[in-house]
Amino acid sequence: GSERTCCPVNWVEHERSCYWFSRSGKAWADADNYCRLEDAHLVVVTSWEEQKFVQHHIGPVNTWMGLHDQNGPWKWVDGTDYETGFKNWRPEQPDDWYGHGLGGGEDCAHFTDDGRWNDDVCQRPYRWVCETELDKASQEPPLL
Protein backbone atom coordinates (compact mmCIF):
# COMPACT_ATOMS: atom_id res chain seq x y z
CA GLY A 1 0.00 0.00 0.00
CA SER A 2 0.98 3.62 -0.39
CA GLU A 3 1.94 5.88 2.49
CA ARG A 4 -0.76 8.18 3.79
CA THR A 5 0.39 11.76 3.18
CA CYS A 6 -2.48 13.75 4.67
CA CYS A 7 -5.11 13.21 7.32
CA PRO A 8 -8.65 12.09 6.51
CA VAL A 9 -11.46 14.66 6.58
CA ASN A 10 -12.39 15.71 10.15
CA TRP A 11 -9.08 14.42 11.55
CA VAL A 12 -6.50 16.77 13.06
CA GLU A 13 -2.86 16.55 12.02
CA HIS A 14 -0.16 16.93 14.65
CA GLU A 15 3.48 15.84 14.57
CA ARG A 16 3.06 13.31 11.74
CA SER A 17 -0.03 11.75 13.32
CA CYS A 18 -3.74 12.20 12.68
CA TYR A 19 -6.24 12.43 15.53
CA TRP A 20 -10.01 12.09 15.63
CA PHE A 21 -11.93 13.29 18.67
CA SER A 22 -15.31 11.74 19.39
CA ARG A 23 -18.23 13.77 20.66
CA SER A 24 -20.23 10.79 21.90
CA GLY A 25 -19.42 8.05 24.39
CA LYS A 26 -18.66 4.35 24.08
CA ALA A 27 -17.33 1.56 26.27
CA TRP A 28 -13.56 1.14 25.91
CA ALA A 29 -13.83 -2.02 23.77
CA ASP A 30 -16.31 -0.37 21.42
CA ALA A 31 -14.12 2.72 21.14
CA ASP A 32 -11.12 0.48 20.45
CA ASN A 33 -13.04 -1.31 17.72
CA TYR A 34 -14.24 1.98 16.21
CA CYS A 35 -10.65 3.17 15.82
CA ARG A 36 -9.54 -0.15 14.33
CA LEU A 37 -12.31 0.05 11.73
CA GLU A 38 -10.88 3.46 10.80
CA ASP A 39 -7.44 1.85 10.29
CA ALA A 40 -6.33 3.62 13.46
CA HIS A 41 -5.99 2.92 17.17
CA LEU A 42 -7.00 4.55 20.42
CA VAL A 43 -4.56 7.33 21.16
CA VAL A 44 -1.14 6.31 22.50
CA VAL A 45 0.48 9.11 24.48
CA THR A 46 4.25 9.03 24.11
CA SER A 47 5.30 12.48 25.32
CA TRP A 48 4.32 15.46 27.41
CA GLU A 49 3.92 17.44 24.21
CA GLU A 50 1.41 14.93 22.82
CA GLN A 51 -0.38 14.87 26.18
CA LYS A 52 -0.86 18.67 26.04
CA PHE A 53 -2.08 18.51 22.44
CA VAL A 54 -4.72 15.89 23.20
CA GLN A 55 -5.70 17.60 26.44
CA HIS A 56 -6.25 20.89 24.58
CA HIS A 57 -8.64 19.21 22.13
CA ILE A 58 -10.69 17.11 24.51
CA GLY A 59 -11.17 19.70 27.26
CA PRO A 60 -12.22 18.71 30.80
CA VAL A 61 -14.04 15.53 29.78
CA ASN A 62 -13.34 11.88 30.64
CA THR A 63 -11.89 10.38 27.46
CA TRP A 64 -10.55 6.90 26.73
CA MET A 65 -6.99 6.32 25.57
CA GLY A 66 -5.32 3.18 24.22
CA LEU A 67 -4.01 1.89 27.54
CA HIS A 68 -5.42 -1.04 29.53
CA ASP A 69 -4.46 -3.83 31.91
CA GLN A 70 -7.29 -6.25 31.21
CA ASN A 71 -4.81 -9.13 30.93
CA GLY A 72 -2.65 -8.09 33.88
CA PRO A 73 0.24 -5.95 32.61
CA TRP A 74 -0.44 -2.40 31.43
CA LYS A 75 -0.40 -2.41 27.62
CA TRP A 76 -0.58 0.26 24.96
CA VAL A 77 -2.74 -0.89 22.04
CA ASP A 78 -0.01 -0.25 19.46
CA GLY A 79 2.65 -2.18 21.37
CA THR A 80 4.47 0.87 22.74
CA ASP A 81 6.29 -0.22 25.91
CA TYR A 82 4.44 0.93 29.01
CA GLU A 83 7.34 0.50 31.40
CA THR A 84 9.74 2.82 29.62
CA GLY A 85 7.14 5.15 28.16
CA PHE A 86 5.46 8.41 29.16
CA LYS A 87 3.03 8.27 32.10
CA ASN A 88 0.74 10.92 33.53
CA TRP A 89 -1.38 9.25 36.22
CA ARG A 90 -3.30 11.25 38.77
CA PRO A 91 -1.91 10.97 42.29
CA GLU A 92 -3.14 7.72 43.88
CA GLN A 93 -3.84 6.23 40.46
CA PRO A 94 -4.04 3.63 39.07
CA ASP A 95 -5.89 1.97 41.94
CA ASP A 96 -7.88 -0.89 40.36
CA TRP A 97 -10.81 0.17 42.54
CA TYR A 98 -13.50 -2.42 43.26
CA GLY A 99 -15.83 -0.14 45.20
CA HIS A 100 -17.99 0.74 42.20
CA GLY A 101 -19.85 -2.56 42.63
CA LEU A 102 -20.00 -3.28 38.90
CA GLY A 103 -17.82 -6.37 39.13
CA GLY A 104 -14.07 -6.54 38.63
CA GLY A 105 -11.67 -3.68 39.19
CA GLU A 106 -10.66 -0.90 36.82
CA ASP A 107 -8.76 -1.99 33.74
CA CYS A 108 -8.93 0.86 31.21
CA ALA A 109 -7.19 4.24 31.30
CA HIS A 110 -8.75 7.59 30.49
CA PHE A 111 -7.94 11.27 30.57
CA THR A 112 -9.70 12.96 33.49
CA ASP A 113 -11.02 16.52 33.67
CA ASP A 114 -7.52 17.89 34.33
CA GLY A 115 -5.88 15.69 31.69
CA ARG A 116 -4.12 13.38 34.08
CA TRP A 117 -4.91 9.67 33.84
CA ASN A 118 -7.16 7.39 35.85
CA ASP A 119 -8.07 3.73 35.55
CA ASP A 120 -11.79 3.07 35.36
CA VAL A 121 -14.39 0.42 34.56
CA CYS A 122 -13.99 -0.38 30.87
CA GLN A 123 -17.75 -0.45 30.32
CA ARG A 124 -18.22 3.23 31.10
CA PRO A 125 -19.38 5.22 28.03
CA TYR A 126 -16.63 7.82 27.73
CA ARG A 127 -15.53 9.83 24.74
CA TRP A 128 -12.44 8.60 22.93
CA VAL A 129 -9.59 9.65 20.66
CA CYS A 130 -8.35 7.72 17.64
CA GLU A 131 -4.83 8.13 16.28
CA THR A 132 -3.09 6.98 13.13
CA GLU A 133 0.41 7.70 11.91
CA LEU A 134 0.84 9.66 8.69
CA ASP A 135 3.84 7.64 7.57
CA LYS A 136 2.00 4.35 8.08
CA ALA A 137 1.25 2.48 4.88
CA SER A 138 -2.46 2.73 4.11
CA GLN A 139 -4.55 -0.40 3.61
CA GLU A 140 -5.65 0.68 0.14
CA PRO A 141 -4.24 -1.49 -2.67
CA PRO A 142 -1.81 0.26 -5.02
CA LEU A 143 -3.16 1.52 -8.35
CA LEU A 144 -2.01 -0.68 -11.22
Epitope: N71, K87, Q93, D96, Y98, G103, G104
Partner: antibody
Framework: EVQLVESGGGLVQPGGSLRLSCAAS????????MNWVRQAPGKGLEWVSS????????YYADSVKGRFTISRDNAKNSLYLQMNSLRDEDTAVYYC???????WGQGTLVTVSS | DIQMTQSPSSLSASVGDRVTITCRAS??????LAWFQQKPGKAPKSLIV???SLQSGVPSKFSGSGSGTDFTLTISSLQPEDFATYYC?????????FGGGTKVEIK
Amino acid sequence: EVQLVESGGGLVQPGGSLRLSCAASGFTFSSYSMNWVRQAPGKGLEWVSSISGRNTTIYYADSVKGRFTISRDNAKNSLYLQMNSLRDEDTAVYYCSRDRGSCWGQGTLVTVSS
Amino acid sequence: DIQMTQSPSSLSASVGDRVTITCRASQDINNYLAWFQQKPGKAPKSLIVAASSLQSGVPSKFSGSGSGTDFTLTISSLQPEDFATYYCQQYNSYPLTFGGGTKVEIK
Protein backbone atom coordinates in the same frame (compact mmCIF):
# COMPACT_ATOMS: atom_id res chain seq x y z
CA GLU B 1 12.50 -9.21 33.15
CA VAL B 2 9.73 -9.09 35.75
CA GLN B 3 10.85 -10.62 39.03
CA LEU B 4 9.31 -11.06 42.47
CA VAL B 5 11.45 -12.42 45.31
CA GLU B 6 9.95 -13.18 48.72
CA SER B 7 11.92 -13.38 51.96
CA GLY B 8 11.34 -13.40 55.71
CA GLY B 9 9.79 -16.82 56.20
CA GLY B 10 10.85 -19.18 58.93
CA LEU B 11 9.84 -21.06 62.06
CA VAL B 12 7.85 -19.13 64.65
CA GLN B 13 5.91 -20.12 67.75
CA PRO B 14 2.12 -19.71 67.98
CA GLY B 15 1.32 -16.14 69.00
CA GLY B 16 4.54 -14.89 67.47
CA SER B 17 5.18 -12.42 64.66
CA LEU B 18 6.93 -12.44 61.32
CA ARG B 19 7.40 -9.89 58.55
CA LEU B 20 7.53 -11.07 54.96
CA SER B 21 9.03 -8.99 52.16
CA CYS B 22 8.67 -9.16 48.40
CA ALA B 23 11.26 -7.36 46.28
CA ALA B 24 9.98 -6.43 42.83
CA SER B 25 11.95 -5.54 39.73
CA GLY B 26 11.50 -5.21 35.98
CA PHE B 27 8.26 -3.20 36.02
CA THR B 28 6.72 0.07 37.22
CA PHE B 29 5.87 -1.15 40.70
CA SER B 30 3.54 1.72 41.65
CA SER B 31 1.27 0.99 38.65
CA TYR B 32 0.21 -2.40 39.94
CA SER B 33 -1.90 -3.88 42.68
CA MET B 34 -0.02 -6.55 44.60
CA ASN B 35 -1.23 -9.62 46.46
CA TRP B 36 -0.24 -12.18 49.02
CA VAL B 37 -1.48 -15.73 48.41
CA ARG B 38 -0.66 -18.72 50.58
CA GLN B 39 -0.68 -22.48 50.24
CA ALA B 40 -0.76 -24.79 53.24
CA PRO B 41 1.21 -28.06 52.83
CA GLY B 42 -0.65 -30.35 50.43
CA LYS B 43 -3.55 -27.90 50.08
CA GLY B 44 -4.86 -25.46 47.51
CA LEU B 45 -4.26 -21.74 47.00
CA GLU B 46 -5.76 -19.20 49.41
CA TRP B 47 -5.81 -15.46 48.80
CA VAL B 48 -4.60 -13.51 51.84
CA SER B 49 -4.47 -9.80 51.05
CA SER B 50 -4.21 -7.18 48.28
CA ILE B 51 -3.05 -3.58 48.09
CA SER B 52 -3.52 -1.07 45.29
CA GLY B 53 -0.61 0.57 43.51
CA ARG B 54 -0.66 3.80 45.52
CA ASN B 55 -1.73 2.33 48.87
CA THR B 56 -5.28 3.66 48.56
CA THR B 57 -7.17 0.38 48.83
CA ILE B 58 -6.42 -2.66 50.98
CA TYR B 59 -8.31 -5.94 51.31
CA TYR B 60 -7.87 -8.91 53.66
CA ALA B 61 -9.24 -12.43 53.90
CA ASP B 62 -11.44 -12.87 56.99
CA SER B 63 -9.01 -15.52 58.25
CA VAL B 64 -6.21 -12.94 58.72
CA LYS B 65 -8.14 -9.69 59.33
CA GLY B 66 -6.90 -7.90 62.44
CA ARG B 67 -3.74 -10.01 62.61
CA PHE B 68 -1.98 -9.35 59.28
CA THR B 69 -1.07 -6.00 57.74
CA ILE B 70 -0.13 -5.53 54.10
CA SER B 71 1.94 -2.52 53.05
CA ARG B 72 4.24 -1.37 50.29
CA ASP B 73 7.11 1.04 49.73
CA ASN B 74 7.01 2.19 46.12
CA ALA B 75 10.34 3.98 46.49
CA LYS B 76 11.93 0.64 47.36
CA ASN B 77 9.81 -1.48 44.98
CA SER B 78 8.86 -3.62 47.93
CA LEU B 79 5.75 -5.30 49.29
CA TYR B 80 5.38 -6.42 52.90
CA LEU B 81 3.17 -8.61 55.06
CA GLN B 82 3.35 -8.10 58.80
CA MET B 83 1.96 -11.21 60.48
CA ASN B 84 1.05 -11.06 64.18
CA SER B 85 -0.68 -13.49 66.54
CA LEU B 86 0.33 -16.36 64.31
CA ARG B 87 -1.56 -19.63 64.52
CA ASP B 88 -0.78 -23.21 63.53
CA GLU B 89 -3.16 -22.86 60.58
CA ASP B 90 -1.08 -19.99 59.16
CA THR B 91 1.63 -22.52 58.27
CA ALA B 92 2.02 -22.25 54.51
CA VAL B 93 4.16 -21.15 51.62
CA TYR B 94 3.44 -17.44 51.09
CA TYR B 95 3.61 -16.07 47.57
CA CYS B 96 3.49 -12.49 46.39
CA SER B 97 1.86 -11.92 43.04
CA ARG B 98 1.16 -9.00 40.75
CA ASP B 99 -2.20 -7.74 39.43
CA ARG B 100 -4.35 -10.68 38.25
CA GLY B 101 -1.57 -13.11 39.08
CA SER B 102 0.33 -12.56 35.84
CA CYS B 103 3.56 -13.11 37.74
CA TRP B 104 4.47 -14.75 41.04
CA GLY B 105 7.43 -15.03 43.34
CA GLN B 106 8.98 -18.36 44.27
CA GLY B 107 7.37 -18.32 47.72
CA THR B 108 8.66 -18.31 51.29
CA LEU B 109 7.74 -20.96 53.87
CA VAL B 110 6.22 -19.89 57.18
CA THR B 111 6.00 -22.61 59.81
CA VAL B 112 4.04 -21.92 63.01
CA SER B 113 4.80 -24.56 65.60
CA SER B 114 5.72 -24.92 69.24
CA ASP C 1 -18.22 -14.55 49.41
CA ILE C 2 -18.15 -16.20 46.00
CA GLN C 3 -17.47 -19.93 46.11
CA MET C 4 -15.58 -21.51 43.22
CA THR C 5 -16.20 -25.20 42.61
CA GLN C 6 -13.80 -27.05 40.34
CA SER C 7 -14.42 -30.46 38.82
CA PRO C 8 -13.11 -33.01 38.67
CA SER C 9 -10.74 -32.77 41.64
CA SER C 10 -8.41 -35.14 39.83
CA LEU C 11 -8.25 -36.92 36.50
CA SER C 12 -6.01 -39.42 34.75
CA ALA C 13 -5.26 -38.87 31.10
CA SER C 14 -2.83 -39.98 28.42
CA VAL C 15 -0.47 -37.93 26.28
CA GLY C 16 -2.44 -36.60 23.32
CA ASP C 17 -5.79 -36.60 25.12
CA ARG C 18 -8.13 -33.63 25.10
CA VAL C 19 -8.76 -32.56 28.69
CA THR C 20 -11.53 -30.30 29.99
CA ILE C 21 -11.70 -28.87 33.50
CA THR C 22 -14.76 -26.99 34.69
CA CYS C 23 -15.17 -24.24 37.25
CA ARG C 24 -18.49 -23.03 38.61
CA ALA C 25 -19.03 -19.80 40.53
CA SER C 26 -21.71 -19.51 43.20
CA GLN C 27 -22.86 -16.25 41.58
CA ASP C 28 -22.36 -14.33 38.35
CA ILE C 29 -18.74 -13.21 37.95
CA ASN C 30 -19.05 -11.88 34.38
CA ASN C 31 -15.79 -12.96 32.73
CA TYR C 32 -13.54 -12.13 35.68
CA LEU C 33 -11.93 -15.54 35.87
CA ALA C 34 -8.30 -16.63 35.72
CA TRP C 35 -6.73 -20.07 35.30
CA PHE C 36 -3.39 -21.10 36.83
CA GLN C 37 -1.11 -24.09 36.43
CA GLN C 38 1.04 -25.30 39.33
CA LYS C 39 3.67 -27.98 39.34
CA PRO C 40 4.93 -29.59 42.57
CA GLY C 41 7.27 -27.31 44.52
CA LYS C 42 6.78 -24.44 42.09
CA ALA C 43 4.83 -21.18 42.09
CA PRO C 44 1.57 -20.99 40.14
CA LYS C 45 1.76 -19.81 36.54
CA SER C 46 -0.93 -17.72 34.89
CA LEU C 47 -2.48 -19.34 31.83
CA ILE C 48 -5.66 -17.41 31.10
CA VAL C 49 -7.32 -14.23 32.33
CA ALA C 50 -10.72 -12.70 31.55
CA ALA C 51 -12.04 -16.27 31.09
CA SER C 52 -10.57 -16.71 27.61
CA SER C 53 -7.54 -14.44 27.07
CA LEU C 54 -4.35 -16.45 26.78
CA GLN C 55 -1.43 -14.98 28.69
CA SER C 56 1.67 -14.03 26.74
CA GLY C 57 3.91 -17.03 26.11
CA VAL C 58 1.27 -19.64 26.94
CA PRO C 59 0.86 -22.23 24.16
CA SER C 60 -2.36 -22.20 22.16
CA LYS C 61 -3.21 -25.77 23.21
CA PHE C 62 -4.70 -24.08 26.30
CA SER C 63 -8.03 -22.36 25.87
CA GLY C 64 -10.67 -20.98 28.19
CA SER C 65 -14.34 -20.29 27.74
CA GLY C 66 -17.43 -19.33 29.67
CA SER C 67 -19.10 -16.34 31.25
CA GLY C 68 -21.39 -15.76 34.19
CA THR C 69 -21.09 -18.81 36.41
CA ASP C 70 -19.77 -21.65 34.25
CA PHE C 71 -16.25 -21.81 32.86
CA THR C 72 -13.98 -24.36 31.25
CA LEU C 73 -10.27 -24.81 30.70
CA THR C 74 -9.38 -27.07 27.79
CA ILE C 75 -6.03 -28.59 26.91
CA SER C 76 -6.41 -29.71 23.30
CA SER C 77 -3.61 -32.28 23.26
CA LEU C 78 -2.06 -33.17 26.59
CA GLN C 79 1.75 -33.22 26.67
CA PRO C 80 4.08 -34.58 29.40
CA GLU C 81 4.80 -31.06 30.66
CA ASP C 82 1.07 -30.44 31.23
CA PHE C 83 0.73 -32.90 34.10
CA ALA C 84 0.12 -30.50 36.99
CA THR C 85 -2.59 -29.04 39.20
CA TYR C 86 -4.88 -26.40 37.70
CA TYR C 87 -6.74 -23.72 39.65
CA CYS C 88 -9.44 -21.24 38.70
CA GLN C 89 -9.79 -17.92 40.51
CA GLN C 90 -12.49 -15.28 40.41
CA TYR C 91 -11.56 -11.61 40.58
CA ASN C 92 -15.06 -10.20 40.21
CA SER C 93 -15.10 -9.14 43.85
CA TYR C 94 -13.20 -9.38 47.12
CA PRO C 95 -12.42 -11.66 48.79
CA LEU C 96 -10.70 -13.22 45.78
CA THR C 97 -11.39 -16.95 45.78
CA PHE C 98 -9.80 -19.98 44.17
CA GLY C 99 -11.28 -23.27 43.14
CA GLY C 100 -10.05 -26.34 44.99
CA GLY C 101 -7.81 -27.41 42.13
CA THR C 102 -7.77 -30.20 39.56
CA LYS C 103 -4.80 -32.56 39.55
CA VAL C 104 -4.04 -33.92 36.08
CA GLU C 105 -2.14 -37.19 36.36
CA ILE C 106 -0.67 -39.63 33.87
CA LYS C 107 -2.85 -42.63 33.11
